[in-house]
Interface confidence: low
């Protein structure tokens, strides 16, 4: 495939990544799938700069990100290391992260109305943000 050099229509470029901001709500799994079908992933926040950028675009609305602990430890969907990476949890959050992996837990992370993170029930229909890297090879065949 060819490398992306610019963002798709209706996506916003920031620091060599492209972002798409939903205006409807989906369960985390459905949002995750939506981004994958767009050859992207739920947003992975790696810095305070990126946090501020996303926060500016979503406003004070609960919004899914690509962080979950459904199989035990917290994991970013793109493999970014959680333990050493950027975090912006609300005080006393995450509060239900005993990592049972059995459903019914607060296993997915979202931006809250003030931008800080909370873990919540993955089935809640929140808005979401997709992200894809500009330097990533796209799935489209190269132009001949």
């Amino acid at each position: 495939g060819s490398e992306r050099t610019c963002c798709p229509v209706n996506w916003v470029e920031h620091e060599r990544s492209c972002y798409w901001f939903s205006r409807s709500g989906k369960a985390w799994a459905d949002a995750d799938n939506y981004c994958r079908l767009e050859d992207a992933h739920l947003v992975v926040v790696t810095s305070w700069e990126e946090q501020k950028f996303v926060q500016h675009h979503i406003g004070p609305v609960n919004t899914w990100m690509g962080l979950h602990d459904q199989n035990g430890p917290w994991k970013w969907v793109d493999g970014t290391d959680y333990e050493t990476g950027f975090k912006n949890w609300r005080p006393e959050q995450p509060d239900d992260w005993y990592g049972h992996g059995l459903g019914g837990g607060e296993d997915c992370a979202h931006f809250t109305d003030d931008g800080r993170w909370n873990d919540d029930v993955c089935q809640r229909p929140y808005r979401w943000v997709c992200e894809t890297e500009l330097d990533k090879a796209s799935q489209e065949p190269p132009l001949l």
Epitope: A27, A29, D32, D96, G103, G104, G105, Q123
Partner: antibody, heavy 116, light 113 residues
Framework: QVQLVESGGGLVKPGGSLRLSCAAS????????MSWIRQAPGKGLEWVLY????????YYADSVKGRFTISRDNAKNSLYLQMNSLRAEDTAVYYC?????????WGQGTTVTVSS | DIVMTQSPDSLAVSLGERATINCKSS????????????LAWYQQKPGQPPKLLIY???TRESGVPDRFSGSGSGTDFTLTISSLQAEDVTVYYC?????????FGPGTKVDIT
């Protein structure tokens, strides 16, 4: 052994209120989501509400939203269901159940009858 | 809401024969991030609360006889009783716990011919 025991059911007039309790024993109560499920006479099962282990997250089915409130007291290993503005269609056996990816432990149920 | 349907409404099977109950969800309950189907099966005898038989569509609950098995993925699921026993004659429900509100199927009654 792991057990759930409901109480508080009874006969109430339309518009009235009732508070159901569910006493848990035999497991670490605060580690589990808990649900209330009801079953009208001769009918199927209807899941109505749940609450997270810490009590910070609740969810209500549309049929009870604004009328029913779920709460828990982890220190007392107890789950509660406050039912207000009761209607005839709320008549059912009410079960509390432990949510573990599938409802794996159920109480015997308590009967609520709403009738004038 | 995800709507759950079951078929047949009732079925009659000879003792020792196979009983098959189908459950269909109006949208997929499969979550690829953990490779699981968020579907459970319950048995309910008269005057008793439901009993969990199967969760994650195919995992048998502890203590459930191995004649009960679950299969399927996505939107189509099956509960199979490989050799019907007299104590299995009752009502069976499927339930999805993928999307709020969690919803049950209408139930299937199993009888002996």
């Amino acid at each position: 052994q792991v057990q759930l025991v409901e109480s508080g059911g009874g006969l109430v007039k339309p518009g009235g209120s009732l508070r159901l309790s569910c006493a848990a024993s035999g497991f670490t109560f605060s580690d589990y989501y808990m649900s209330w499920i009801r079953q009208a006479p001769g009918k199927g099962l209807e899941w109505v509400l749940y609450i997270s282990g810490s009590g910070t997250t609740t969810y209500y089915a549309d049929s009870v939203k604004g009328r029913f409130t779920i709460s828990r007291d982890n220190a007392k290993n107890s789950l509660y269901l406050q039912m207000n503005s009761l209607r005839a269609e709320d008549t059912a056996v009410y079960y509390c159940a432990r949510d573990r990816g599938g409802l794996d432990v159920w109480g015997q149920g308590t009967t609520v009858t709403v009738s004038s | 809401d995800i709507v759950m349907t079951q078929s047949p409404d009732s079925l009659a099977v000879s003792l020792g024969e196979r009983a098959t109950i189908n459950c269909k969800s109006s949208q997929s309950v499969f979550f690829h991030s953990n490779n699981k189907n968020y579907l459970a099966w319950y048995q309910q005898k008269p005057g008793q609360p439901p009993k969990l038989l199967i969760y994650w569509a195919s995992t048998r609950e502890s203590g459930v006889p191995d004649r009960f098995s679950g299969s399927g993925s996505g939107t189509d699921f099956t509960l199979t009783i490989s050799s019907l026993q007299a104590e299995d004659v009752t009502v069976y429900y499927c339930q999805q716990y993928f999307s709020l509100p969690f919803t049950f199927g209408p139930g299937t009654k199993v009888d002996i011919t």
